[in-house]
Amino acid sequence: VEVQVSEDPVVALVDTDATLRCSFSPEPGFSLAQLNLIWQLTDTKQLVHSFTEGRDQGSAYSNRTALFPDLLVQGNASLRLQRVRVTDEGSYTCFVSIQDFDSAAVSLQVAAPYSKPSMTLEPNKDLRPGNMVTITCSSYQGYPEAEVFWKDGQGVPLTGNVTTSQMANERGLFDVHSVLRVVLGANGTYSCLVRNPVLQQDAHGSVTITGQPLTFPPEA
């Protein structure tokens, strides 16, 4: 028996369902009573879901997995993982035994988009050219860790005096806080871009200082 899985990682958004595809080619006359199908975590071999001795033996993994029972006889051994969590990320092995056996691993990459950044300034009043100002760009509930880029109004990258921190919450999602310290010119626009490297999703925030008062561009 030959087991086939997708070579590319499966990317799943947090709280959505994911299908880990796995298939085999049944011989003529194949019956489910002959099938041993086991999904397990590749690294630890912890059982995830199994179908053996003609029976679906259920989810051993947070009760969030299911097979496609009507498709098994056609060689579809795919696993449905419901309500994906950050902790589900990793490699899963599909093990199929009929007379002989084969196995293959599929990777699950979990992702969550970052929120539109909110921008704050300190100090936020009585600003004059030459003042040192701290601009904070905050974006929430993303996964995996973000890449953060700052630019000025001319699109020139700002790399000095940037401090970025990323903290995971209890669900494993990251809140990003990036702080830029700059000396104000007469006018200035400062943009922050928070990129999710898996989703290739960019979230933008900016603040414009035009003398007095400060203005924030309207939300897109």
């Epitope: 397990q40 912890q46 053996t52 029976r55 033996q57 009760n63 035994s97 056996f101 196995s103």
Partner: antibody, heavy 117, light 106 residues
């Protein structure tokens, strides 16, 4: 015919570890789940965990997860259950049992483990 | 975990009696399995998939039920039937057993 023959009785001290064996014969060892079940003196049956010899997949009861390791040696058709950090409450008969569909259809004769100082 | 509660826990009966043991599950299960255990012996599978007799088990044993309520019936007790009986489920992990029903001679 299916036979599961377990290792003999053990007397061990608290804090130690023990490894019980279960030698299978009369069937294709790699095709069936092997379970381990605990029965304390005068008590009922408690599932410890299981392993599939072919893939090595295992699943443990959360109550035992931190102290139990179930393994197999395919070359000798033998399953093992190792229990660590033993305490008096671990005194019990331990059974290996082969799956039959969703049941445990064939059982070993049991291994009495006594934890005593 | 799915809890299985057997009733009664103890049962006194005479040879020839019809006895019924009930197993109630805390959540719905697909199938129930029944075992017999005699003192100093390993458990023996009696009934699989709720109602199917395991190989070599006399036809006086029968099982029925669905959802959360299952029963084991012995139609006419024989002397060799006095033992402890356990129900078990594998619809959900961990696998669980009932606490047992001890069947004694009256």
């Amino acid at each position: 015919q299916v036979q599961l023959v377990q290792s003999g009785a053990e007397v061990v001290k608290p804090g130690a570890s023990v490894k019980v064996s279960c030698k299978a014969s009369g069937y294709t060892f790699t095709n069936y789940w092997m379970h381990w079940v605990k029965q304390a003196p005068g008590q009922g049956l408690e599932w410890i965990g299981m392993i599939h010899p072919n893939s090595g997949a295992f699943n443990y009861n959360e109550r035992f997860k931190t102290r139990v390791t179930i393994t197999v040696d395919k070359s000798t058709s033998t399953a093992y259950m190792e229990l660590s950090s033993l305490r008096s409450e671990d005194t019990a008969v331990y059974y290996c049992a082969r799956s039959t569909a969703l049941a445990t259809g064939y059982w070993g004769q049991g291994t009495l483990l006594t934890v005593s100082s | 975990d799915i809890q299985l509660t057997q009733s009664p826990s103890f049962l006194s009966a005479s040879v020839g009696d019809r006895v019924t043991i009930t197993c109630s599950a805390s959540s719905s299960v697909s199938y129930m399995y029944w075992y017999q255990q005699k003192p100093g012996k390993s458990p023996k599978l009696l009934i699989y998939d709720t109602s199917n007799l395991a190989s070599g088990v006399p036809s006086r044993f029968s099982g029925s039920g669905s959802g959360t309520e299952y029963t084991l019936t012995i139609s006419s007790l024989q002397p060799e039937d006095f033992a402890t009986y356990y129900c078990q489920q594998w619809s959900s992990y961990p696998l669980t057993f009932g606490q047992g029903t001890k069947l004694e001679i009256k």
